[in-house]
Amino acid sequence: VPEKSVRWCAVSEHEATKCQSFRDHMKSVLPSNGPSVACVKKASHLDCIRAIAANEADAVTLDAGLVYDAYLAPNNLKPVVAEFYGSKEDPQTFYYAVAVVKKDSDFQMNQLRGRKSCHTGLGRSAGWNIPIGLLYCDLPEPRKPLEKAVANFFSGSCVPCADGTDFPQLCQLCPGCGCSTLNQYFSYSGAFKCLKDGAGDVAFVKHSTIFENLANKADRDQYELLCLDNTRKSVDEYKDCHLARVPSHTVVARSVGGKEDLIWELLNQAQEHFGKDKSKEFQLFSSPHGKDLLFKDSAHGFLKVPPRMDAKMYLGYEYITAIRNLREGTCPEAPTDECKPVKWCALSHHERLKCDEWSVNSAGKIECESAETTEDCIAKIMNGEADAMSLDGGFVYIAGMCGLVPVLAENYNTPNPNCENTAEEGYFAVAVVKSSSDLTWDNLKGKKSCHTAVGRTAGWNIPMGLLYSKINHCRFDEFFSEGCAPGSEKNSSLCKLCMGPSPNLCEPNNKEGYYGYTGAFRCLVEKGDVAFVKHQTVPQNTGGKNPDAWAKNLKEEDYELLCLDGSRKSVQEPANCHLARAPNHAVVARKDKADCVQTLLLDQQRMFGSSVTDCSSNFCLFESKTKDLLFRDDTVCLAKLHDRNTYEKYLGEEYVKAVTNLRKCSTSPLLEACTF
């Protein structure tokens, strides 16, 4: 197979015919050294998935349910290109499966038992697989056959295409369960009409169904959405209140050696030449031979799926949960209202050791999961492999953009017993220099910089945000002569100063000696000119407070703070000499796990929090000898957020605006994936 050939998998004679036409037309418009198309015919989409996994083909376009099959071992395929619908200016690559109810009804998602339900059709995504998958563990046993369990869960339903003889309750609201538009309650509009007419109490449809059926806002205001956290929201708020986000139609390829760049190059060229309204001879998104061949006829073009986005992230936790429940038919033994152990995400092996000790002391109420970077941990929480972790504000922003929520804040200044209910204002992000140097905020160009990590608040977002507004470009590695900013590109000058050791050089975790607050300060002590840290870093690592060899003889008076007005002040004066106020670190979790995480952590800190006086012989949650493992070492308690329970409210408008501005310079693959 030539290196630049993409072997497209076709699943019917008609698709194979269109594929050959695609191949021939691409040949006519692409240079001889460009990508080319070859066609491979298989009997089914599942056969195509297997062929790609076995390197007998390279690409195929799949519906969401098949993307799930493609992702499962041993296939291990990943999404590489998404079809989009709507306009180029506002491309839609996903739709949202929602549960719609009338505003004047008074039940929540966890009170659907005994209600009447309207579905688009048996086995369909938004109307059946997703809602029934998510409700699966609430269905009465035995759960097989599924239709019988659903019939016994709701008091009556309309499920078009169901067997009305075997399961009459499923056709109670639409006698016969007709499987076409002859049934007035068939498909999306029909399921909504079933609700509108008062036949049913809830309709399981797409987010767009309400808008397509009710042009008038006043009419739409008579309806609400049921959210998974047992609240309700207006129908406009479907992005924050849905059962699952479903990808429409996706090109998949192998995870390793999958030719994704070549596939994108091919499809990008294809949409330029043969996309909507581009060519008379060949159209990518239609065919005289049949409907939806190779690609959906309704597609308007393609978008490249960000490289960080694997199938789990692409399909989303809710969708995977629903489909897995339906396919595997397994439910936890514990009742669903009981909190299961919380899986904490630990960064690399130092944090993992502390987490393990916590796990042992918590009698298994805490379990541990590891990842090499904070972003990998956030991704694990998103997909359910982990449940929670404590994050710097910069990562609270990324986690928030990825759908996680803040649960508790680390407090550093409020003594107990008021600590748990106090909302602190935050800490100061400062720039520290040696007293012996002549540096000011205005002459940092060409100097050596030390940062906690890329994407963190005090070490990156605040100083680089301020710098960006001064230099108006993102080439920070050119502004400083060299530095250590863990998480930078390995060949960047901002990795040059890092200490490693080798394979971990410049990695954003504790294996890099200059990572974090203490690491950035150590970088200043040993190699750098300026360190961007929190205001407590110098006092916490001088005067013998840090026993490590590099720190034990350091004196606080040998360091000063840079003020934005060009002056310098003592490290004792951060309130009058700082770069900005930073939001405290916070624990984040998935919405569905937030209450359990909060309850458990408040309980854990009563046992292992700052009330424990002797940490040499007892487990202490907020102690790790200046290493800030799992939590910052200066944490006094984890505090309730009250109404600051979204990332925007928690971080504050000013900080969110600053980080959003800095997104122009973002090197966060996860953020790119989460905003796709």
Partner: nanobody, 117 residues
Framework: QVQLVESGGGLVQPGGSLRLSCAAS????????MAWYRQAPGKQRELVAG???????KYADSVKGRFTISRDNAKNTVYLQMNNLKPEDTAIYYC???????????WGQGTQVTVSS
């Protein structure tokens, strides 16, 4: 620095038993949480079992019901009784007292356990 010395490993057939011991120099170990870890070739080091100073225990799912961790504070020793051993239990077993491990990568030499017929 507390020194930890592991012993009791060896070659055993599937279904067999071994008892590992970890002797700590200094009485500090009696008041710390102690744990056994293992590392198989090419794999990450993983927690097998842990025991707090008060005697409450935690086990990895893969060893629950087969392994038992215990401690004798008078002897400054922690034990791991391993029954119904399986080939996948083959690894070097290490013990730790957690006292300084967060910021100092100190481990004993470990003891090799090989389960093979």
């Amino acid at each position: 620095q507390v020194q930890l010395v592991e012993s009791g490993g060896g070659l055993v057939q599937p279904g067999g038993s071994l008892r590992l011991s970890c002797a700590a120099s200094g009485s500090i170990a009696s008041i710390n949480t102690m744990a056994w870890y293992r590392q198989a070739p090419g794999k990450q080091r993983e927690l097998v079992a842990g025991i707090t100073s008060g005697g409450s225990t935690k086990y990895a799912d893969s060893v629950k019901g087969r392994f038992t961790i215990s401690r004798d504070n008078a002897k400054n020793t922690v034990y791991l009784q391993m029954n119904n051993l399986k080939p996948e239990d083959t690894a070097i077993y290490y013990c730790t007292d957690y006292s300084k491990r967060y910021y100092q990568d100190y481990w004993g030499q470990g003891t090799q356990v090989t389960v093979s017929s």
